[in-house]
């Protein structure tokens, strides 16, 4: 089982590992040569610290934490990263018009520290 | 409140053309593709096809190419479901439906349009 | 023949809990999501659970989905007399794009 500790951030409020929405054109994603639509996506994405337990996705995520403690010169702490993602559909250009294609790891749709 | 309100009932006789609508309101419209289902008397639903209102963009499912066309006029928030020859075999309730944020699910649905043809 | 497949109907008691199943393939709910419709005799469908969890707002947290492998499922606990109704499982399928089952008719006894 996952060993997720508590979401109380002892760095204040908002400081710490999170889910954040930007709003994004086709042309700030660098998409706008190959996707028709949606021409501004609502991105998801993981920001933040990760403290000591804070959201550890795991043991080792606990174990970083520690080493990280003792020696923070070797060991970086824990990444905020996404623990699963909401799909997503979009409307591409092809070789003969248009389809659909749908895309399982784009928006993040919760964060962990790991 | 997001609504979406299709057109009322029709009747025509095989062979006859048809053109059907459902009116967005409550959201913006070009931010949010529209897609069509069919629903045949007692049976199950049918993913017609979807339209990008914003570009007019549209895909059809392989099973309605070429039987239907779906366009839209997003300067009265519009979308619309064409047929240039009906069949018999087009008589169903056609629902139009908003698609969620990510263009996976249909979070808004029309209350339909029965589409009745018969000689 | 739907690409997804559901049981017919399935039936159960006031306060029951019933489940209905909704079995796909590789190409399809095996690597994307499952959404839930509710559809009222004589009523448009309602998204009653999408991206094979969520419930929209307004939904009563009596329905419940979940996945697993190349099946989902949806449960119904507390079941109510309102809750008789076709339900609808919907995915993604590489080559059909949006798919739906053909459709699960619920019957509260009693």
């Known amino acids: 089982a996952r060993a997720r500790n508590g979401d109380h951030c002892p760095l204040g409020p908002g400081r710490c590992c999170r889910l954040h929405t930007v709003r994004a054109s086709l042309e700030d994603l660098g998409w706008a040569d190959w996707v028709l639509s949606p021409r501004e996506v609502q991105v998801t994405m993981c920001i933040g610290a990760c403290p000591s337990q804070f959201r550890a996705a795991n043991r080792h995520a606990q174990i970083k934490t520690s080493l990280h403690r003792l020696k923070p010169d070797t060991v970086p702490a824990p990444c905020c990263v996404p623990a699963s993602y909401n799909p997503m559909v979009l409307i591409q250009k092809t070789d003969t018009g248009v389809s659909l294609q749908t895309y399982d790891d784009l928006l993040a749709k919760d964060c962990h520290c790991i | 409140e997001v609504q979406l309100v299709q057109s009322g009932a029709e009747v025509k006789k095989p062979g006859e053309s048809l053109k059907i609508s459902c009116k967005g309101s409550?959201?913006?419209?070009?931010?949010?593709?529209i897609g069509w289902v069919r629903q045949m008397p007692g049976k199950g639903l049918e993913w017609m096809g979807v339209?990008?209102?914003?570009?007019?963009?549209?895909i059809y499912s392989p099973s309605f190419q070429g039987q239907v066309t779906i366009s839209a006029d997003k300067s009265i928030s519009t979308a619309y479901l064409q047929w240039s020859s009906l069949k018999a075999s087009d008589t169903a309730m056609y629902y139009c439906?908003?698609?969620?944020?990510?263009?996976?699910?249909?979070?808004?649905w029309g209350q339909g349009t029965l589409v009745t043809v018969s000689s | 023949q739907s690409v997804l497949t559901q049981p017919p109907s399935v039936s159960g008691a006031p306060g029951q809990r019933v489940t209905i199943s909704c079995s796909g393939s590789?190409?399809?709910?095996?690597?994307?999501?499952v959404n839930w419709y509710q559809q009222l005799p004589g009523t448009a469908p309602k998204l009653l659970i999408y991206?094979?969890?969520n419930r929209p707002s307004g939904v009563p947290d009596r329905f419940s989905g979940s996945k697993s492998g190349t099946s989902a499922s949806l449960a119904i606990t507390g079941l109510q007399a309102e809750d008789e109704a076709d339900y609808y499982c919907?995915?993604?399928?590489?080559?059909?794009?949006?798919?739906f089952g053909g459709g699960t008719k619920l019957t509260v006894l009693g």
């Open positions: 439906a908003r698609y969620g944020r990510y263009g996976t699910y249909f979070d808004y």
């Open positions: 590789s190409s399809n709910i095996g690597v994307l999501y």
């Open positions: 919907q995915s993604w399928d590489s080559s059909s794009n949006y798919v």
């Open positions: 339209i990008d209102p914003d570009g007019s963009y549209t």
């Open positions: 991206s094979n969890d």
């Open positions: 409550g959201y913006s419209f070009t931010s949010y593709w």
